[in-house]
């Protein structure tokens, strides 16, 4: 009633470990860590035989194969590097996600190397079986812009990926009789997100209630240069549009807002985010110089406000840009309480352009962003949106333009994002 | 094309209460609010209040905050407003509009008499 | 609260004649930033609903006939029909959008 000698499978080992087995005997195959029992092209920890009346073992030795992870998950704006030869994904192979960069980074910095673990699951030291995450890159240009030191008066071209944060926003609103049609700008911030001025995004009505434009009357288009060429752009329409929930139509006050993206669109050099800047009530700093890019900055002679109630027919064909520097906060509010009307400057606006006056001073699209570059993260980050300007003609002398300072609204911009700022911390100014 | 079609006339009594309808067709309910307005027998126009049926937002003339009640049944395409401790100054023709007053609704008459 | 005031209370005019209606605003009803005034005029006939003739003081609704015209800014505005028709008899209102809404007491227009 003795049984045959058994061998253990490579990679395994049999228990209990005897010289003889007789009827009744029971061992248990296992394998070394990294390796599984397979039996029948069936995978198991462990199996047991038994030694059988008749001196013959109730099944044959299964062997032990190599534990495999199977091809990685597939990481969204992501890639993977096999560090091991041939692409093997068995046990103890390592892999590395990376970011396509230079468009996303890789959150919290993490390493993006995984291993193939005994349980057969791609393991990070950090973040476990969970996949990292790639947040979109804000605030650098494919191209560098122009240093800030000369001057420029009145608008400039800009190249094609010089502003690839801006938006185009074209809205159609047909719930209005007559139909009505208007643009303005906007600046991406991630790849679902734009932020816009909400009298943009305001249905223009015979009285002064805040009520947005219907999200179907809403295309946005990005990675655009020349209207006259829309084929090279992104054209998105709208989830979602939401108003600042105190924006105030009399003096603009929290004139800001967001359009949802309905999908995604993807980043490359001539769509990419702009930086949120720190959520500080200060603002930007008087005399700093700063960029906006528009396309209806052309016209001299015509207000922010004319421009955005005239339709398209105004529009700059090729997407210009001005340098302007921040104006004190004292010396705006005075030139504005000196004229006739109700012009009040208040703590949720800035005032940036030349006292003399000059094209600059007249920033075409409402809702652009008036960005600043900062020295400590070397990126551009969105201090300001085109918001509103004096009665007088563009450009004209001490006529500033207004600006809402967007670090007042950071944490409201996250929220309704719908992110904690920790979790998108790149994408903050540090 | 663009309808308001409102209920019809009401006879109340006194301190009691009345649900005048108005039923939108024609355009996206939602996208626009809908406006009320009041008229006494051979008096002016007073405006009573809106509300913007994509959030339920509401604003009241200060003298019929305590009067009216104005609600929205989206899936219906319907507005309602409620008065409530009627009284015999409460006679007037209601009126709703919308689309910023392009489109109006034909007038309910509430008479409160004993 | 902003107070609307007519003038005059009724008005007759000569078929074929200018009428002329003034409305003041307790308070100026021009928004400095969309540089519009929010006033507008409506007519009102016997057992109809008003109808809007005029927004932002001067803009003309669709459909309606160009002897209306609207003019002013701030407090002070005026609604002119150039040469009156008989369909024209009714009774017209401005009203505020400004801050709420708030119609003007109305003024009646009769062919003389």
């Known amino acids: 009633n003795e049984c045959p000698e058994l061998q253990p499978p490579v990679h395994g080992k049999i228990e209990p470990s005897q010289a003889k087995y007789f009827f009744k005997d029971q061992v248990l195959v296992s394998c070394d860590t990294g390796y599984k029992v397979l039996k029948d092209n069936v995978e198991m920890d462990t199996f047991q035989i038994e030694c059988l009346k008749d001196g013959t073992w109730s099944n044959k030795i299964p062997t032990c194969k190599i534990v495999d992870c199977r091809a990685p998950g597939e990481l969204e704006h992501g890639l993977i590097t096999f560090s091991t030869r041939n692409n093997l994904t068995t046990y103890k192979s390592e892999i590395k996600y990376s970011c396509q960069e230079p468009y996303y980074k890789m959150l919290n910095n993490n390493t993006g190397i995984y291993t193939c673990s005994a349980q057969g699951v791609w393991m990070n030291k950090v973040l476990g079986r969970s996949l990292p995450t790639c947040l979109p890159e804000c605030g650098q240009p494919s191209r560098s812009l122009p240093s800030l030191v000369k001057r420029i008066i009145g608008g400039r071209n800009a190249e094609p990926g010089l502003f690839p944060w801006q938006a185009l926003i074209v809205v159609e609103d047909t719930s209005r009789v007559p139909n009505d049609k208007w643009f303005g700008s906007g600046a991406l911030l991630s790849a679902s997100w734009i932020l816009t001025a909400a009298h943009v995004l305001r249905s223009q009505r015979r009285d002064t209630t805040v009520i947005p434009v219907s999200k179907e009357h809403v295309t946005v288009y990005l990675g655009l240069h020349d209207v006259r060429d829309k084929s090279g752009a992104v054209n998105s329409s709208a989830a979602r549009v939401v108003l600042h929930p105190d924006f105030n139509i009399q003096n603009y006050n929290h004139d800001i807002a967001l359009v949802q993206l309905q999908e995604p669109v993807p980043l490359g050099p001539h769509v990419m985010p702009v930086c949120l800047p720190r959520l500080e009530p200060e603002g930007p700093a008087p005399h700093m110089l700063g960029l906006v890019a528009g396309w209806g900055i052309s016209n001299p002679n015509v207000t922010v406000d004319e421009i955005i109630s005239s339709g398209t027919r105004t529009l700059s064909d090729v997407l210009q840009y001005v340098k302007l520097p921040v104006v004190p906060h004292a010396e705006c509010k005075t030139s504005y309480e000196s004229r006739s009307g109700n012009y009040s400057v208040t703590e949720n606006m800035f005032c940036a352009g030349y006292y003399e006056g000059g094209k600059d001073t007249c920033l075409g699209d409402s809702g652009g962003a008036f960005v600043i570059f900062d020295d400590l993260s070397q990126r551009w980050v969105v201090q300001g949106l085109v918001s509103w300007g004096g009665p007088e003609e563009c450009g004209s002398k001490q006529v500033y333009g207004v600006y809402t300072k967007v670090s007042n609204y950071v944490d409201w911009v996250w929220e309704q994002m719908g992110l904690p700022q920790s979790v998108v911390e790149p994408q903050v100014e540090r | 094309q663009v309808q308001l079609v409102q209920s019809g006339a009401e006879v109340k009594k006194p301190g009691a209460s009345v649900k005048v309808s108005c039923k939108a067709s024609?355009?996206?309910?939602?996208?626009?609010?809908i406006n009320w307005v009041r008229q006494a027998p051979g008096q002016g126009l007073e405006w009573i209040g809106w509300?913007?049926?994509?959030?339920?937002?509401?604003k009241y003339n200060d003298k019929f905050k305590d009067k009216a009640t104005l609600t929205v049944d989206t899936s219906s395409n319907t507005a309602y407003m409620e008065l409530s401790s009627l009284r015999s100054e409460d006679t007037a023709v209601y009126y709703c509009?919308?689309?910023?007053?392009?489109?109006w609704g034909q007038g309910t008459l509430v008479t409160v008499s004993s | 609260d902003i107070v609307m005031t007519q003038s005059p209370d009724s008005l007759a005019v000569s078929l074929g004649e200018r009428a002329t209606i003034n409305c003041k605003s307790s308070?100026?009803?021009?928004?400095?930033?969309?540089?519009?005034?929010?006033l507008a005029w409506y007519q009102q006939k016997p057992g109809q609903p008003p109808k809007l003739l005029i927004y932002?003081?001067?803009t003309r609704e669709s459909g309606v006939p160009d002897r209306f015209s609207g003019s002013g800014s701030g407090t002070d505005f005026t609604l002119t029909i150039s040469s009156l028709q008989a369909e024209d008899v009714a009774v017209y209102y401005c009203?505020?959008?400004?801050?709420?809404?708030?119609f003007g007491q109305g003024t009646k227009v009769e062919i003389k």
């Open positions: 509009s919308s689309l910023e007053d392009t489109y």
């Open positions: 509300i913007y049926p994509r959030d339920d937002r509401t």
């Open positions: 308070q100026s009803l021009l928004a400095s930033r969309t540089r519009k005034n929010y």
């Open positions: 932002w003081a001067s």
């Open positions: 024609g355009y996206t309910f939602t996208t626009d609010d």
């Open positions: 009203k505020q959008s400004y801050n709420l809404y708030t």
